[in-house]
């Protein structure tokens, strides 16, 4: 079954996918698609890379990490409920039936209503690197400690996002990274 990731309406969603290039700059084509991975490539492609660069993308979908180092995690900007569903990350390793495919389930939750009349900030827009935090514990504490004046609802939302980010890191650290070569 698919690994599940969550985001709220209006935020940026993060879907992790990694591989380790055999050598620096020795990239492998990758595609991201909406829908489970089919036999070849991706269905309803939203982003594609080749051996050198991102060669196809659609609005709101981008790679926030360093894809030249194998971080091909997908960021979806300003999500709506319609963005819910399964996404396919396919790492097209050359050879006979060598493709690695990952189905990731994105669940979009309605945005929380914030009753406080304080100035609102879109966290993922203000802190776009927040969801790509790699470290555990101290790095996350430091991220929380460096936040500007925000309300409790936003802190709660941030904590949830960091929890989901930690899940992504745990997945990566538990062997979801594909090594090539």
């Amino acid at each position: 079954s698919e690994v599940e990731y969550r985001a709220e309406v209006g935020q940026n969603a993060y879907l992790p996918c990694f591989y380790t290039p055999a050598a620096p700059g020795n990239l492998v084509p990758v595609c991201w698609g909406k829908g489970a991975c089919p036999v070849f490539e991706c269905g309803n492609v939203v982003l594609r890379t080749d051996e050198r660069d991102v060669n196809y993308w659609t609005s709101r979908y981008w790679l926030n990490g360093d894809f030249r180092k194998g971080d091909v995690s997908l960021t979806i900007e300003n999500v709506t409920l319609a963005d819910s569903g399964i996404y396919c990350c396919r790492i097209q390793i050359p050879g006979i039936m060598n493709d690695e495919k990952f189905n990731l389930k994105l669940v979009i939750k309605p945005a929380k209503v914030t009753p406080a009349p304080t100035r609102q900030r879109d966290f993922t827009a203000a802190f776009p690197r927040m969801l790509t935090t790699r470290g555990h514990g101290p790095a996350e504490t430091q991220t929380l400690g460096s936040l500007p004046d925000i309300n409790l609802t936003q802190i709660s939302t941030l904590a949830n996002e960091l929890r989901d980010s930690r899940l992504a890191n745990d997945l990566r650290d538990s062997g979801a990274t594909i090594r090539i070569g």
């Epitope: 698609g33 829908g35 489970a36 089919p38 036999v39 070849f40 490539e41 659609t58």
Partner: antibody, heavy 123, light 107 residues
Framework: EVQLVESGGGLVKPGGSLRLSCAAS????????MTWVRQAPGKGLEWVSS????????YYLDSLKSRFTISRDNAKNILYLQMNSLRAEDTAVYYC????????????????WGQGTLVTVSS | DIQMTQSPSSLSASVGDRVTITCRAS??????LTWYQQKPGKSPKLLVY???TLAEGVPSRFSGSGSGTQFSLTISSLQPEDFANYYC?????????FGQGTKLEIK
């Protein structure tokens, strides 16, 4: 006009080899996945093998991958299927087909097919 | 492997009839299903892909539906040129697999 023309079929003895070719024209060959599908006399369709745009990724029916090799020459617009250690059960019409494709789609279904070439394996 | 089971295996109908061919997958294939038409001595022709999208140039009397494990191809009003063999094909799991075919004959 898109055209796929297979050749190389014929009568071969069990254990023999054949190389099928599929000459493509009317489209940018290097932009498309290509596939071989076969059909035994009076039977249904069976997928054999597929190859990606640049030939770096290949896919086979498990039971055939030790004997069959798919390849392509994008400079000549030709798709190949090398068949070794042929058996009677490999007797079929072999079709080459183009994987439907545009940016944003996946090439998992086949929009153009050749006329087929008959391979008969018999002693 | 994902097994594709078509029914019926053969069907007799008349010009003007509405006919439906079904295809069942042995596991969930989402909407990754294609329908082909093949006439005797000819190569297959793409009719419908992604379960319900009509291929270019295919008459609107053809329609596809379904998702998951149950799919169907409907011809709303049979024409003489529609008498042929029909195959479904899944493109979710490796290997690609086809149904055994449905032979549509003139009654």
């Amino acid at each position: 006009e898109v055209q796929l023309v297979e050749s190389g079929g014929g009568l071969v003895k069990p254990g023999g080899s054949l190389r099928l070719s599929c000459a493509a024209s009317g489209f940018t060959f290097s932009d498309y996945y290509m596939t071989w599908v076969r059909q035994a006399p009076g039977k249904g369709l069976e997928w054999v093998s597929s190859i990606n745009y640049d030939g770096r990724n290949t896919y086979y029916l498990d039971s055939l991958k030790s004997r069959f090799t798919i390849s392509r020459d994008n400079a000549k617009n030709i798709l190949y299927l090398q068949m070794n250690s042929l058996r009677a059960e490999d007797t079929a019409v072999y079709y080459c087909a183009r994987g439907y494709y545009y940016y944003g789609s996946s090439p998992n279904y086949f929009d153009y097919w050749g006329q087929g070439t008959l391979v008969t394996v018999s002693s | 492997d994902i097994q594709m089971t078509q029914s019926p295996s053969s069907l007799s109908a008349s010009v003007g009839d509405r006919v439906t061919i079904t295809c069942r997958a042995s596991e969930n294939i989402y909407s990754y299903l294609t329908w082909y038409q093949q006439k005797p001595g000819k190569s297959p022709k793409l009719l419908v892909y992604n379960a319900k999208t009509l291929a270019e140039g295919v008459p609107s009397r053809f329609s596809g539906s379904g998702s998951g494990t149950q799919f169907s191809l409907t011809i709303s009003s049979l024409q003489p040129e529609d008498f042929a063999n029909y195959y479904c094909q899944q493109h979710y799991g490796t290997p690609l697999t086809f149904g055994q075919g449905t032979k549509l004959e003139i009654k």
